[in-house]
């Protein structure tokens, strides 16, 4: 009878048990972005390192062509940090002249693409006005939350301006997901 | 045959099952830092509360001497928030005089130390330029991501300037990790 | 004997096994806030969408009257992002006149209410001074950490100024929790 203390009761377990070490997981890190054309009103997607340094994918979570592929339906925690850096924005010059203005901004979006849906779904957005006056500035935007995903869904990270992304260190800009 | 719906198939489970409540976990909260000398080019490590208030360590995850000790290999979610506060930086005065300048900055790094490695590994970095003009400023930097850690690894949180860390409330500055 | 590789040993498991898909989880998304009275020195609580779009509650995690109800004791990861937006603060005007001043600020607090406790407990706080000079500004505050909660605990998100919360998109302002 000793084993019964570990035996899940019918009330407790509604799905097959599975070992945690077997769950789809990925942590991707920044790489220098290759120049690519993107449509004017569409935020470009970042591409990522998936196996060197701190980066990894495991248990059928695969990375291909800017996308993380979801191999199994379930609830996933998804996160990303993008560190932006830039020189003084137009904003500050206009401001110094005493005229109010629409601020420059930096934005990160984690997007889900489902092949059967015509439109991508924005899961998470971090957006910040940037009106810096020093000669250069830098700052991170961090996002993270839980979503119910379906097998075959694809995840990507889009940014408002790819040229402002700090690609110099794997700990500054990253993207990850894991099945809960 | 009823029990079979809970029985893991060979395809599903590649590691022993284990109860979630038994996993190494810690949430550490800020304490006032003691006066210490630190080397000029090295970011000082914060020390933490590990048992009072909201803080805890459990299931062999131990805190000692500024380090979280990893008791078991696996994938961990690691997070920290540091709230910084300060008075107007030199930056703003130079700026007001109309000369651009290198901004002051605040930085948080979550670092892994592996005894067999000569150099610590920076897992996560949040860094932000600070060019504030009001008479005082405050802001948080949040970090969180998943990493594959080995038994015996040690985690710490380093900051660019320990004197700017807001130590006044346990909900403002904290550090945690849990095995997935 | 083949099954033994999956059988938890007495050392490994101290609690009943349970399927991950059965754990209490919620992701709530922003809705437009209805004007409500709140006490002067008390931050108002946000109310949330719990079933439309990206929002969901599952496995006995219920949302009612601004609160997430914790159905089962255990360690939970709790997170929220609030995106704030506003027009130029008084702060910048005073500053331009050359007089230093106490900055305006934006604050998010994740609060736990336990019926047997007279006082709510602040679990997480993100607070930021806002001294923007552009004609409008926007920025997120993100929080997330792990806490030991008891069955019956209630969670809410409080903000310093409800009128500054960006309620326009479900990916900008959100609140979630899941049992680890």
């Amino acid at each position: 009878l000793k084993g019964q203390e570990f035996a899940p009761s019918h009330q407790q377990v509604y799905a097959p048990l599975r070992a945690d070490g077997d769950k789809p997981r990925a942590h991707l890190t920044v790489v220098r972005q290759t120049p690519t054309q993107h449509f004017k009103n569409q935020f470009p997607a970042l591409h990522w390192e998936h196996e060197l340094g701190l980066a990894f994918t495991k248990n059928r979570m695969n990375y291909t062509n800017k996308f993380l592929l979801i191999p199994e339906s379930g609830d996933y925690f998804i996160y990303s940090q993008v560190t932006f850096r830039g020189m003084t924005s137009e904003c500050s010059e206009i401001r110094q002249a005493g005229r109010p203005n629409k601020p420059d901004s930096i934005t990160v979006v984690i997007t889900k693409v489902t092949d059967s849906y015509p439109e991508p779904t924005q899961l998470l957005m971090g957006t910040k006005s940037v009106c810096e006056v020093g000669s250069n500035w830098f700052q991170p935007i961090y996002l993270g939350a839980m979503f119910s995903l379906q097998e075959g869904d694809k995840l990507m990270v889009n940014v408002s301006d790819i040229s402002l992304v700090d690609y110099t260190k794997e700990d500054k800009t990253f993207f990850g997901a894991f099945l809960l | 045959l009823k029990g079979q719906e809970f029985a893991p198939s060979h395809q599903q489970v590649y590691a022993p099952l284990r109860a979630d409540g038994d996993k190494p976990r810690a949430h550490l909260t800020v304490v006032r830092q003691t006066p210490t000398q630190h080397f000029k080019n090295q970011f000082p490590a914060l020390h933490w509360e590990h048992e009072l208030g909201l803080a805890f360590t459990k299931n062999r995850m131990n805190y000692t001497n500024k380090f979280l000790l990893i008791p078991e290999s696996g994938d961990y979610f690691i997070y920290s928030q540091v709230t910084f506060r300060g008075m107007t930086s030199e930056c703003s005065e130079i700026r007001q005089a109309g000369r651009p300048n290198k901004p002051d900055s605040i930085t948080v790094v979550i670092t892994k130390v592996t005894d067999s490695y000569p150099e610590p590994t920076q897992l996560l970095m949040g860094t932000k330029s600070v060019c504030e003009v009001g008479s005082n400023w405050f802001q948080p930097i949040y970090l969180g991501a998943m990493f594959s850690l080995q038994e015996g690894d040690k985690l710490m949180v380093n900051v660019s300037d320990i004197s700017l860390v807001d130590y006044t409330k346990e909900d403002k500055t904290f550090f945690g990790a849990f095995l997935l | 004997l083949k099954g033994q590789e999956f059988a938890p040993s007495h050392q490994q498991v101290y609690a009943p096994l349970r399927a991950d898909g059965d754990k209490p989880r919620a992701h709530l998304t922003v809705v437009r806030q209805t004007p409500t009275q709140h006490f002067k020195n008390q931050f108002p609580a946000l109310h949330w969408e719990h079933e439309l779009g990206l929002a969901f509650t599952k496995n006995r995690m219920n949302y009612t009257n601004k609160f997430l109800l914790i159905p089962e004791s255990g360690d939970y990861f709790i997170y929220s992002q609030v995106t704030f937006r506003g027009m130029t603060s008084e702060c910048s005007e005073i500053r331009q006149a050359g007089r230093p001043n106490k900055p305006d600020s934006i604050t998010v607090v994740i609060t736990k209410v336990t019926d047997s406790y007279p006082e709510p407990t602040q679990l997480l706080m993100g607070t930021k001074s806002v001294c923007e000079v552009g004609s409008n500004w926007f920025q997120p505050i993100y929080l997330g950490a792990m806490f030991s909660l008891q069955e019956g605990d209630k969670l809410m998100v409080n903000v310093s100024d409800i009128s500054l919360v960006d309620y326009t998109k479900e990916d900008k302002t959100f609140f979630g929790a899941f049992l680890l």
């Epitope: - | 304490v31 006032r32 006066p35 210490t36 008075m87 930086s89 008479s135 005082n136 004197s163 | 230093p100």
Partner: antibody, heavy 119, light 111 residues
Framework: QVQLVQSGAEVKKPGASVKVSCKAS????????INWVRQAPGQGLEWMGW????????GYAQKFQGRVTMTADRSTSTAYMELSSLRSEDTAVYYC????????????WGQGTLVTVSS | QSVLTQPPSVSGAPGQRVTISCTSS?????????VLWYQQLPGTAPKLLIE???NRPSGVPDRFSGSKSGTSASLTITGLLPEDEGDYYC??????????FGGGTKLTVLG
């Protein structure tokens, strides 16, 4: 109103120890750090360290490390500062002060305790 | 270890304005929590006058004001009164989280 009331004057011999008390009233004792500052006759102020009465954690100035011990008795809302291995240069008025958490200012001060070290 | 330097003494007639400076040996003075000023009247404990460079706690007259420029902070007293006579100390917290006091400035009100 907030009050910090310190123990009376002490005369000690070199090599001895002294323990000065600071009884707090008019506020929640565990919510504010207590600092100790001393002032030698005709001299300026010198910071010795801080005590968190809630946790018992302390931070001492480099100069006093190994010689000073700060403690609290929460049941009586009293902070203590003990200085050992006294020498003549330790002759001073010793003040306790309550610190404002947000600004780290010493907002309320005790009346001071004169400690004289003389053989 | 940084040091805060104050002039040993200043003086002024009643009604006049005096300024006491506090200069840091390090690059920025009180970057974390600013500079605080205390008044110590003869035979009494110090009293907080200014926190965070500029801010007066309630009960402190607006004749007292603080300012900052680069590595220096200043306390200005306008409309000097005889009862202002005493010692004035600046204080800040250094990078090692130790509190530093200036050497103190003796204010004499003439006449």
């Amino acid at each position: 109103q907030v009050q910090l009331v310190q123990s009376g004057a002490e005369v000690k011999k070199p090599g001895a120890s002294v323990k000065v008390s600071c009884k707090a009233s008019g506020y929640t004792f565990t919510s504010y750090d207590i600092n100790w500052v001393r002032q030698a006759p005709g001299q300026g102020l010198e910071w010795m360290g801080w005590l968190n009465p809630n946790s018992g954690y302390t931070g001492y100035a480099q100069k006093f490390q190994g010689r000073v011990t700060m403690t609290a008795d929460r049941s009586t809302s009293t902070a203590y500062m003990e200085l050992s291995s006294l020498r003549s240069e330790d002759t001073a008025v010793y003040y306790c002060a309550r610190e404002v958490p947000e600004t780290a200012a010493f907002e309320y001060w005790g009346q001071g305790t004169l400690v004289t070290v003389s053989s | 270890q940084s040091v805060l330097t104050q002039p040993p003494s200043v003086s002024g007639a009643p009604g006049q304005r005096v300024t006491i400076s506090c200069t840091s040996s390090s690059s920025d003075i009180g970057a974390g929590l600013g500079v605080l000023w205390y008044q110590q009247l003869p035979g009494t404990a110090p009293k907080l006058l200014i926190e965070g460079y500029y801010n007066r706690p309630s009960g402190v007259p607006d004749r007292f004001s603080g300012s900052k420029s680069g590595t220096s902070a200043s306390l200005t007293i306008t409309g000097l009164l005889p009862e202002d006579e005493g010692d004035y100390y600046c204080q800040s917290w250094d990078g090692t989280l130790s509190a530093l006091f200036g050497g103190g400035t003796k204010l004499t009100v003439l006449g």
